[in-house]
Interface confidence: medium
Amino acid sequence: TLNSVLNSNAIKNLPPPLGGAAGHPGSAVSAAPGILYPGGNKYQTIDNYQPYPCAEDEECGTDEYCASPTRGGDAGVQICLACRKRRKRCMRHAMCCPGNYCKNGICVSSDQNHFRGEIEETITESFGNDHSTLDGYSRRTTLSSKMYHTKGQEGSVCLRSSDCASGLCCARHFWSKICKPVLKEGQVCTKHRRKGSHGLEIFQRCYCGEGLSCRIQKDHHQASNSSRLHTCQRH
């Protein structure tokens, strides 16, 4: 149950449709961990980007990190900056875009590594999948070709988001990962940073839809770290 996906659902080879369950259209803001809307956040290109003040990476979208906008600038003035793409310089994993991690000061691809795209990475890290079956994605193509013509609908079992139809992502629903609806504005999302210390999400939310970032709700800034509520918000 794994594999990197978040960079535009990068990996295009696919197992099944069919299996799990579907979304819960009505539940815009529910912090219940098992709601059928699982999450994290998707890599997005950021146009008309509005600076968002922050104190730590957790307050930014998953495609962002928190830092001073100028090199050597005032540490007290920090904003959410766009994540760094492959081969760009970095100082920590959070600076690199999903699907990459910081190695020797450079953002490198996580495809051959246990840092994986945000949703997939949570599952790989947290659920201890062995990597022996993953090193060559081509082994999956031996599965019967009839599996491949239709994209998974809501509730279909999947291995990665590219298995799912548009508007859906591949997220854990305990027994397996299934295609679930991408989150809409105002819906509760789950923040993950690539720090290798994820909580185990048995029931996982999708990432926020296009133009949205998973950010801490403004009125929750004073709350303790553990009780902060993140929702999908416009850039």
């Epitope: 197992p15 369950a21 529910s30 098992g34 659920f127 082994r139 397996s176």
Partner: antibody
């Protein structure tokens, strides 16, 4: 806490239909989907299918297609599993499960 | 017939280590689908023991551990205790059947 309360034991004759219930409490019922799993006496576990408690969408195991119907009533947080054309080898304990939580099972005996 | 094969029985003296295998194929475990393990005490419903190949839910003793490699998975019980006497089932998803599957089950006896 999460609980799945199943209906009482039933005795049926071959050819009849069976409908058992599973009532969820302690969680957001429509937010999850429920599976039905059965276990014949002295045998292993057999997955029968699932129902999405929100939309009512279903997916049945190949062995049961055409004979099983899963429904739900969100107003009372209940799911139902109906099995038709019963045979003696349908004698089993039928469990509903939210995957991480299981009901205690409903014992069904099919005998003439 | 189950597509996940387990040994029918396993046994050990108290304090010993017992390992149960769960052998699948490229359409289930080998395809990357997670393996979960359940313990079923006599007359009771199955209880989740290990999920996502190697994770223990809270309340499950660390004597229980799971692993997965290739097309098979295994459950290890170290420091076997009398209360571990039960049936153990592995479970995964099978793409060729488009459904969830359970292993054949293993009865663990504490000698």
């Amino acid at each position: 806490q999460v609980q799945l309360l199943q209906s009482a034991a039933e005795v049926k004759k071959p050819g009849e239909s069976l409908k058992i219930s599973c009532k969820g409490s302690g969680y957001d019922f429509p937010g999850y989907y429920l599976h039905w799993v059965r276990q014949a006496p002295g045998q292993g576990l057999e997955w029968m299918g699932w129902i999405n408690a929100n939309s009512g969408a279903t997916n049945y195991a190949q062995n049961f297609q055409g004979r099983v119907t899963m429904t739900r009533d969100t107003s009372i947080s209940a799911a139902y599993m109906e099995l038709s054309s019963l045979r003696s080898d349908d004698t089993a304990v039928y469990y509903c499960t939210r995957e991480d939580h299981w009901g205690r099972g409903t014992t069904v005996t099919v005998s003439s | 017939q189950s597509v996940l094969t387990q040994p029918p029985s396993a046994s050990g003296a108290p304090g010993q280590r017992v390992t149960i295998s769960c052998t699948g194929s490229s359409s289930n475990i080998g395809a990357g689908y997670d393996v979960h393990w359940y313990q079923q005490l006599p007359g009771a419903a199955p209880k989740l023991l290990i999920y996502g190949n190697s994770n223990r839910p809270s309340g499950v003793p660390d004597r229980f551990s799971g692993s997965k490699s290739g097309t098979s998975a295994s459950l290890a019980i170290t420091g076997l205790q009398a209360e571990d006497e039960a049936d153990y089932y592995c479970q995964s998803y099978d793409s060729s059947l488009s459904g969830y599957v359970f292993g054949t089950g293993t009865k663990v006896t504490v000698l």
